[in-house]
């Protein structure tokens, strides 16, 4: 959970078992420019474990659009463009926070939700299981 | 921003220029099990573009701990374990939402913030700039 330092000058909390519900300012402070990941870099195409980006849209969620990576090959791409099946492309996944409208369709009430997204792919050596 | 469907049965909004500030329930609905990324897979070690994971902690942020990937090499690791400098290890970055306490140290008041994190690394063919 969140450790709760106390401070006068903070907005009041009515809930004794605080913090269950908090106030969140949606004027996002952006520490970097937000871009469509396809535009921000072409790694998805130049990688030895290339991936496609799929648009996942959900109006009941913020952000409503999340880009999901899907590896293009089970193997990895060699310098000659062919697939090397002795190596494996795997998705790099990350857990992210999103806001889910709760109750549904409500404009000003949300619940935090953790979802797992695939951000891109990397090329790994397979775990070799020796056959007896 | 967030499209605002109207619905009776929703908590009230006092702000005319809504939604600036919304109520967020912090009882996280977890769509997957949350794990330390080091434990969840060993891709960071088996990748041809291996990375180290650095713990970034900030008590004024939720989540307070974020793991940042840093590529180990400029090049990519070959089958023989040597680094191939004709290829490049690059970080795969993703913009994520975090909650930033605002005012500082306040337990029940936050602002949404977007930050860019490196999730892992991938091996890419370098862009070749031809010299005239």
């Amino acid at each position: 959970g969140i450790a709760i330092p106390r401070n006068s000058g903070c907005p009041n909390s009515e809930d004794k078992n605080f913090p269950r519900t908090v106030m969140v300012n949606l004027n996002i402070h952006n520490r970097n420019t937000s871009t469509n990941p396809k535009r921000s870099s072409d790694y998805y195409n130049r990688s030895t474990s290339p991936w496609n980006l799929h648009r996942n849209e959900d109006p009941e969620r913020y952000p409503s659009v999340i880009w999901e990576a899907k590896c293009r090959h089970l193997g990895c791409v060699k310098a000659d463009g062919n697939v090397d099946y002795h190596m494996n492309s795997v998705p790099i996944q990350q857990e992210i926070l999103v806001l889910r409208r709760e109750p549904r369709h409500c404009p000003n009430s949300f619940r935090l939700e953790k979802i797992l997204v695939s951000v891109g792919c990397t090329c790994v050596t397979p775990i070799v299981h020796h056959v007896a | 921003g967030i499209a605002i469907p109207r619905n009776s049965g929703c908590p009230n909004s006092e702000d005319k220029n809504f939604p600036r500030t919304v109520m967020v329930n912090l009882n996280i609905h977890n769509r997957n099990t949350s794990t330390n990324p080091k434990r969840s897979s060993d891709y960071y070690n088996r990748s041809t573009s291996p990375w180290n994971l650095h713990r970034n902690e900030d008590p004024e942020r939720y989540p307070s701990v974020i793991w940042e990937a840093k590529c180990r090499h400029l090049g990519c690791v070959k089958a023989d374990g040597n680094v191939d400098y004709h290829m490049n290890s690059v970080p795969i970055q993703q913009e994520i939402l975090v909650l930033r306490r605002e005012p500082r140290h306040c337990p029940n008041s936050f602002r949404l913030e977007k930050i860019l994190v490196s999730v892992g690394c991938t091996c890419v063919t370098p862009i070749v700039h031809h010299v005239a």
Epitope: N52, H73, L74, Y85, S89, H129 | Y43
Partner: antibody, heavy 120, light 111 residues
Framework: QVQLQQPGAELVMPGTSVRLSCKAS????????MHWVKQRPGQGLEWIGE????????NYNPKFKGKATLTVDKSSSTAYMQFTSLTSEDSAVYYC?????????????WGQGTTLTVSS | DVVMTQTPLSLPVSLGDQASISCRSS???????????LHWYLQKPGQSPKLLIY???NRFSGVPDRFSGSGSGTDFTLKISRVEAEDLGVYFC????????FGGGTKLEIK
């Protein structure tokens, strides 16, 4: 429903080339890989290669590299396989088959096949 | 290439009997993503192959539940619980985790 339409038969002379076609319908052509598979009479199935219609990326079985060339025409949702320097060994049924990507990487729908006969 | 070995070559059965076909691969078919890419097809005379089972044990849409797949690593089995006339034909296993290859086929026929 998903359909992959192939001509029934082709008769060609040794030493020449042939272009086999596969017209897709009933799904989004660019969302699935297209594979080509060879089957000789009484023998097993041999994978020739695959093409991603969205960007025409190709990947070949090393055995068929230089022999087969895969292309697509997105406007007509048609995949093609060009086969060169034909010999009697190339006489076979050639199937096109689609597959999903990555987690869904298996041929789920197949064309009826084109019987290629190489004979003088 | 990964060699896929099917046994038996021919399987005579009576209608209503259980049938079992084995497929062994020369390499492990488990991918680093946790999936095992072993699939089963049925080819009836004069037709193209039809997908029955994908990734070891998942029935493709429209495939009757009398078909089931199992196995792991390098050893896999296709079972038909009660053989019907429409099940006759040649069964192929295939793998797609390496350069895709197919087994030699098992002919299911009436005893």
């Amino acid at each position: 429903q998903v359909q992959l339409q192939q001509p029934g038969a082709e008769l060609v002379m040794p030493g020449t080339s042939v272009r086999l076609s596969c017209k897709a319908s009933g799904y989004t052509f660019t969302s699935y890989w297209m594979h080509w598979v060879k089957q000789r009479p009484g023998q097993g199935l041999e994978w020739i290669g695959e093409i991603d219609p969205s960007d025409t990326y190709t990947n070949y079985n090393p055995k068929f590299k230089g022999k087969a060339t895969l292309t697509v025409d997105k406007s007509s949702s048609t995949a093609y396989m060009q086969f060169t320097s034909l010999t009697s060994e190339d006489s076979a049924v050639y199937y096109c088959a689609r597959s999903g990507i990555y987690y869904d990487y298996y041929e789920d729908y197949w064309g009826q096949g084109t019987t290629l006969t190489v004979s003088s | 290439d990964v060699v896929m070995t099917q046994t038996p070559l021919s399987l005579p059965v009576s209608l209503g009997d259980q049938a079992s076909i084995s497929c062994r691969s020369s390499q492990i078919l488990l991918h680093s993503n946790g999936n095992t890419y072993l699939h089963w097809y049925l080819q009836k005379p004069g037709q193209s192959p039809k997908l029955l089972i994908y990734k070891v044990s998942n029935r493709f849409s429209g495939v009757p539940d009398r078909f089931s797949g199992s196995g792991s690593g390098t050893d896999f089995t296709l079972k038909i619980s009660r053989v019907e006339a429409e099940d006759l034909g040649v069964y192929f296993c295939s793998q797609s985790v390496h350069v895709p290859t197919f087994g030699g086929g098992t002919k299911l026929e009436i005893k």
